[in-house]
């Protein structure tokens, strides 16, 4: 359920507010609907950087749960093959605040277009 993914993103944003994490993360800020699964996989990979950088058990657990929920939601869509999409490393690097903002945006796209 993508709304549960949103809920975990809200928890992560609440948890990182008191931390200083200056990592930059590969961020897709203009997702084409035909590349949304590829983009989501990049977001999930980069989310693990936040988990590692924070060194916080609550963030680690929430990230872990979010990844499971997102992968379950992706697999329920069936095996989608997307072509011509950007590799994660080709994406723009952004700060955590902008990364999370774009992450919410792509999850909302999955909800809105389902």
């Amino acid at each position: 359920n993508w709304v549960n993914v949103i809920s975990d993103l809200k928890k992560i944003e609440d948890l990182i507010q008191s931390m200083h994490i200056d990592a930059t993360l590969y961020t897709e800020s203009d997702v084409h609907p035909s590349c949304k699964v590829t983009a989501m996989k990049c977001f999930l990979l980069e989310l693990q950087v936040i988990s590692l950088e924070s060194g916080d058990a609550s963030i680690h657990d929430t990230v872990e749960n979010l990844i499971i929920l997102a992968n379950n939601s992706l697999s329920s869509n069936g095996n989608v093959t997307e072509s011509g999409c950007k590799e994660c490393e080709e994406l723009e690097e952004k700060n955590i605040k902008e990364f999370l903002q774009s992450f919410v945006h792509i999850v909302q796209m999955f909800i809105n277009t389902s």
């Epitope: 809200k10 609440d14 507010q17 609907p33 903002q101 909302q108 809105n112 277009t113």
Partner: antibody
Amino acid sequence: QVQLQESGPGLVKPSGTLSLTCAVSGGSISSSNWWSWVRQPPGKGLEWIGEIYHYGYTNYNPSLKSRVTISVDKSKNQFSLKLSSVTAADTAVYYCAREGIGWPSFDYWGQGTLVTVSS
Amino acid sequence: SSELTQDPAASVALGQTVRITCQGDTLRSYYASWYQQKPGQAPILVIYGKNNRPSGIPDRFSGSSSGNTASLTITGAQAEDEADYYCNSRDSSGKNLVFGGGTKLTVL
């Protein structure tokens, strides 16, 4: 600075169709944003009507879904609202608005246009 | 009935602090945004996300969230803050946008 401007008839007859257009300037309708219509009956609160993404995806308020159509014209940088089978209860100020990226918000609004349903 | 509930009215003495609240189960998953609307004018976004202010919005406006409640706080209310305030978020399905019923703020 993004600007939105609603246009369309200010008076619609009962059982007719309300048609409005929102012209977007200072930004592209093909951006990552979703675009919405919101209305406000006289002396009452705000009600979301529906939203559109430039690829053509739409979502509508369940209470209005059977009567609403929102469309986009990328060549004119505008989007439109059609509301069919109108009654006096549809009399309201109609706003178009741009949704922010990420958490729910409307970061830019048109000035609004009053549409009265009356014979 | 709205998925977001606001008190219809609130008042504050000039220069004092007021908190306007918005309740709904969906706020456990989504942040709310807040709008100020004065008579005859379009709404203006004052707070979005966790506690973000668009440029031009005074820092006396702040937002917070706990459980199923979102709050808008005005610290040191000014006469020009007298207006209707609306919260906004998504519904429980995540698909639809919803508004609270609005709170009419009077500055005494």
